[in-house]
């Protein structure tokens, strides 16, 4: 555990401790003194730390930042793999904890859990075969991807796999079933009549998190999985296969867990820390595993098993990738191969394993019981070329600038933690583990979390996901800072991400989208409700179609695809850093929060329209059952004038009154806190955002009101429309409480 | 240097066996498909079998269907071919090539090209 404070107060000690009631008027008077004392001092040390020269301040941390620091650091930490539960990531942390130590933080400390990991078996290989008819293999899927040169001699290298497959060995016919979403099972099962029970499925990654392939499959009967890459998804045109480029190669293959785990970290210890004491679950009833064998494969060896699929034709365009095969949706293979059955061979088995979170201390000058959280995660599939380690580089040189300030006798106002994460890769485990046990602190101390994973996707503007309540200071931070962009020399970011990511409802300023999950805030956000965000470099979504970044996840993503083809100057990877570490900076640093809820009100608004509009495709229903939004518009409008308000009141009150100032924080800390409901969304009890929520459909994508949006989901199917309806009603009843709760939170205290 | 070197060849007595290695070095080995191609006397150049980069697939010429075995250390950079119950027809001086797609399997192809060939070791099987 870590321990920021020393709560050992002497003077309130003593005060319990009363002598003689001849004493009062010197405790009294003495009393007044140390009033006075302590209110002097608070604003002689809120002022010495952050409101002499706050420009300066700032300034000095950013000008700190070294585009060559991270890049040494990149090098650094991808020489070999550190995949989660490994010694050599193991060494890593205690290399982080030692570095951080020496940059000045003010304590280090690792903390470890057991949690349930998966591995493939070292002798015993997963892989895809063709059977014919007499049951031999004539035609086997890669054991391992080719390794890049350079890297041929590098052990514990893991072969690609699907990270928490049971066991199994299915044969059966082929069904492709295009992306595996929920709309592509109701395209083929509905439309097209199909069935997939009995059946191994293949789909190709892309548009949604895999885990949500995986369980969309198995409500379809599907034996088992194979996810393959296609170069329409991961090729970009008229770019090379690395290493001549940044595409991926024919035997390059995305590895990834297919947990759904719904927000509760470990699978075995749902709700609590995975220490040494901690009750686990058997597996069979584990958190979130699949119940059918999956395996990842390249597209070359897809090719192989898709050239000879039969069945039915591919419904239109959108089901076909960029393989020369006629993407027939089977089942089974064409005429002369329709003996040949597809079979898995998967043997991978998962175990209880310990991971370390490093977890570094800037303590908070003026309010050290109020947290500032920046974390990203150090495990990675391989290299972790940009995933992670492009982020944790960044965070190296953030903390080391920061460590540069405190050495010079400058303290945060408040306190900034620091944290390198374990088994982000298999379900967040790490971040999540951690909360668990801390979350008594971080609901009551938590301020904000910014997250630091991968800090490219690409090199073309920057993307950012951010609770409303952060859009104004990222809105600010980036007009302050210059543009890395050609063609945009002199200009500021926020000029450069205008103009390439405009907002699709707002003109003149740039895109901000939902947070949704797939990374480590989700347990601070989307559980405790502490105000989040992230931030890094992406592609061009228009003309760049494929998903995430070619090499995701493969033994290819290395040092050498990022100095060679992503940001050779690193210029990218320090934009980030001072986006990263500037929102920390002000967020630890400004005396007034840098929230601001009208903003939030806004998108309540936006919210509330969006899910009228998708209920409004019923109206009949709607009559029938009687559903309104009356309440909820009732509730947005009443957040909007308290919220309104509120700002008011934030820009006029007296910011030397050290307890006016206190309950004015609190207010805009505690906001985010108000939107959470403690019994969670249906079925997923860890996901207590009312506002937002990960898709059900697709864990990477932010959901608004999703306790509405997925009561109204495919409602035209259910077998009892009452109930169905009846549902609607209770989420907007829900969604109503929490909106105008939250508005009273910011109402005036007395 | 990029090269290949094979070894083991020699003069065997029909229904023996003879182990012939192909050692690789200057280039990513264990990145590649390989090759063993054999010559005999005054004859073309006859493909004999292929295994892919990572050894999940390997193809033989009917010919040796069930009699010889591909196999590869990539930690050896080393590629080998078991040959059992040699035949007189067998006689040839084997080479070992490498394929030129980098992990692409060409097994089933009905031509190859090599882009890096060995200089040869002789298999004699004469009673």
């Known amino acids: 555990m870590w321990n920021l404070l020393h709560e050992t107060d002497s003077a309130v000690a003593t005060a319990r401790r009363p002598r003689w009631l001849c004493a009062g008027a010197l405790v009294l008077a003495g009393g007044f003194f140390l009033l006075g004392f302590l209110f002097g001092w608070f604003i002689k040390s809120s002022s010495e730390a952050t409101n002499i020269t706050p420009k300066h301040n700032m300034k000095a941390f950013l000008d700190e930042l070294k585009a060559e620091n991270i890049k040494k650091f990149l090098h650094n930490f991808t020489q070999i793999p550190h995949l989660a539960g490994t010694e050599q990531n193991f060494q890593l942390a205690k290399q982080i904890q030692s570095q951080w130590k020496e940059f000045g933080l003010d304590s280090v400390e690792l903390t470890h859990y057991d949690v349930l990991l998966s591995y493939p078996n070292k002798t015993h290989p997963n892989y895809i075969s063709i059977i014919n008819e007499d049951g031999n293999e004539i035609f086997n899927t890669s054991l391992f991807e080719p390794p890049p040169a350079g890297y041929e001699n590098v052990s514990d290298i893991v072969p690609p796999f699907s990270a928490f497959s049971p066991q199994g060995m299915p044969e059966g016919d082929l069904v492709y079933v295009n992306y595996a979403r929920t709309e592509d099972f109701f395209k083929l099962e509905r439309d097209m009549k199909i069935n997939c029970s009995g059946k191994i499925v293949i789909a190709r990654y892309g548009k949604v998190f895999r885990g949500n392939k995986v369980k969309n499959a198995q409500l379809a009967g599907a034996t088992g999985v194979i996810l393959y890459s296609d170069p329409a998804d991961y090729f970009a045109p008229g770019v090379k296969s690395y290493p001549d480029g940044w595409n991926l190669p024919g035997g390059g293959v995305q590895r990834g867990n297919i947990l759904n785990l719904n927000g509760a970290g470990d699978p075995l210890t749902p709700g609590y820390p995975a220490n040494e004491y901690a009750y686990r679950r058997g597996i069979a009833e584990a958190v979130g595993l699949p119940s059918i064998p999956v395996h990842p494969i390249g597209y070359y060896d897809a090719q192989k098993l898709l050239e000879k699929m039969g069945g039915s034709a591919s419904p239109d365009s959108s089901w076909r990738g960029s393989l020369k095969v006629p993407y027939n949706v089977g089942p089974g293979f064409t005429g002369n191969f329709s003996t040949q059955k597809v079979k898995m061979h998967i043997h991978s088995t998962s175990e209880v394993t310990r991971i370390y979170n490093v977890i570094g201390t800037l303590r908070g000058a003026v309010e050290p019981d109020r947290y500032v959280i920046l974390g990203g995660h150090r495990d990675s599939w391989v290299f972790g070329g940009i995933d992670p380690q492009s982020g944790a580089a960044v965070v190296h040189e953030i903390v080391r600038s920061f460590g540069t300030l405190k050495k010079e006798g400058w303290r945060p106002r408040r306190t900034i933690l620091f944290a390198s994460w374990d088994a982000e890769e298999f379900g967040l485990l790490g971040s999540t583990e951690w909360a668990e046990e801390n979350s008594r602190l971080l609901q009551e101390r938590g301020v904000a979390y910014i997250n630091a994973d991968s800090s490219i996707e690409g090199n073309y503007t920057l993307r950012v996901d951010c609770t409303p309540l952060m859009y104004s200071l990222v809105y600010n931070l980036t007009k302050e800072l210059e543009s890395p962009d050609e063609g945009f020399e002199g200009k500021s970011l926020y000029e450069s991400w205008t103009k390439k990511s405009p907002s699709p409802e707002f003109s003149g300023m740039p895109r901000i989208s939902k947070l949704g999950s797939g990374n480590d805030f989700e347990v601070f956000f989307q559980r405790l409700g502490i105000a989040s965000g992230r931030a890094r470099y992406t592609k061009n979504w228009e003309t760049n179609k494929f998903s995430s970044y070619p090499l995701y996840h493969s033994v290819y993503e290395t040092y050498e695809l990022v100095e060679k083809f992503y940001d050779p100057m690193f210029k990218y990877h320090l934009t980030v850093a001072q986006v990263r570490g500037g929102m920390v900076f002000e967020l630890a640093n400004s005396v007034v929060l840098p929230f601001d809820c009208r903003d939030y009100a806004v998108v309540l608004r936006k919210y509330a329209d969006k899910i009228y509009n998708i209920s409004m495709k019923h109206p009949q229903e709607m009559k029938t059952y009687s559903v309104s939004f009356d309440s909820l518009f009732s509730a947005v409008k009443n957040f909007t004038e308290i919220a309104s308000k509120f700002s008011e009141r934030l820009r006029d009150f007296d910011k030397s009154n050290p307890i006016l100032l206190r309950m004015m924080n609190d207010q805009l800390m505690f906001l985010e806190r108000a939107f959470i409901d403690p019994l969670g969304l249906p079925d997923r009890p860890f996901y207590r955002h009312v506002i937002y929520a990960p898709s059900s459909h697709n864990k990477y994508a932010g959901e608004s009101f999703p306790g509405i949006y997925d009561a109204l989901f495919d409602i035209e199917s259910k077998v009892d429309p009452s109930q169905a309806w009846g549902e609607v009603k209770r989420q907007i009843s829900i969604a109503t409480f929490t909106v105008q709760a939250a508005a009273e939170t910011l109402s005036e205290v007395a | 240097e990029v090269q290949l070197v094979e070894s083991g060849g020699g003069v065997v007595q029909p229904g023996r066996s003879l182990r012939l290695s192909c050692a690789a070095s200057?280039?990513?080995?264990?990145?590649?498909?390989q090759h063993w191609v054999r010559q005999a006397p005054g004859k073309g150049l006859e493909w004999v079998a292929y295994?892919?980069?990572?050894?999940?697939?390997?193809y033989y010429a009917d010919n040796v269907k069930g009699r010889f075995t591909i196999s590869r250390d990539n930690s050896k950079n080393t590629l080998y071919l078991q040959m059992n119950s040699l035949r007189a027809e067998d006689t040839a001086v084997y080479y070992c090539?490498?394929?030129?797609?980098?992990?692409?399997?060409?097994?089933?192809?009905?031509?190859?090209?090599?882009?890096?060939w060995g200089q040869g070791t002789m298999v004699t099987v004469s009673s």
């Open positions: 200057g280039f990513s080995f264990s990145g590649y498909g």
């Open positions: 295994i892919s980069y990572d050894a999940s697939n390997k």
């Open positions: 090539a490498k394929d030129p797609a980098w992990g692409l399997r060409l097994g089933e192809s009905s031509s190859y090209d090599f882009d890096i």
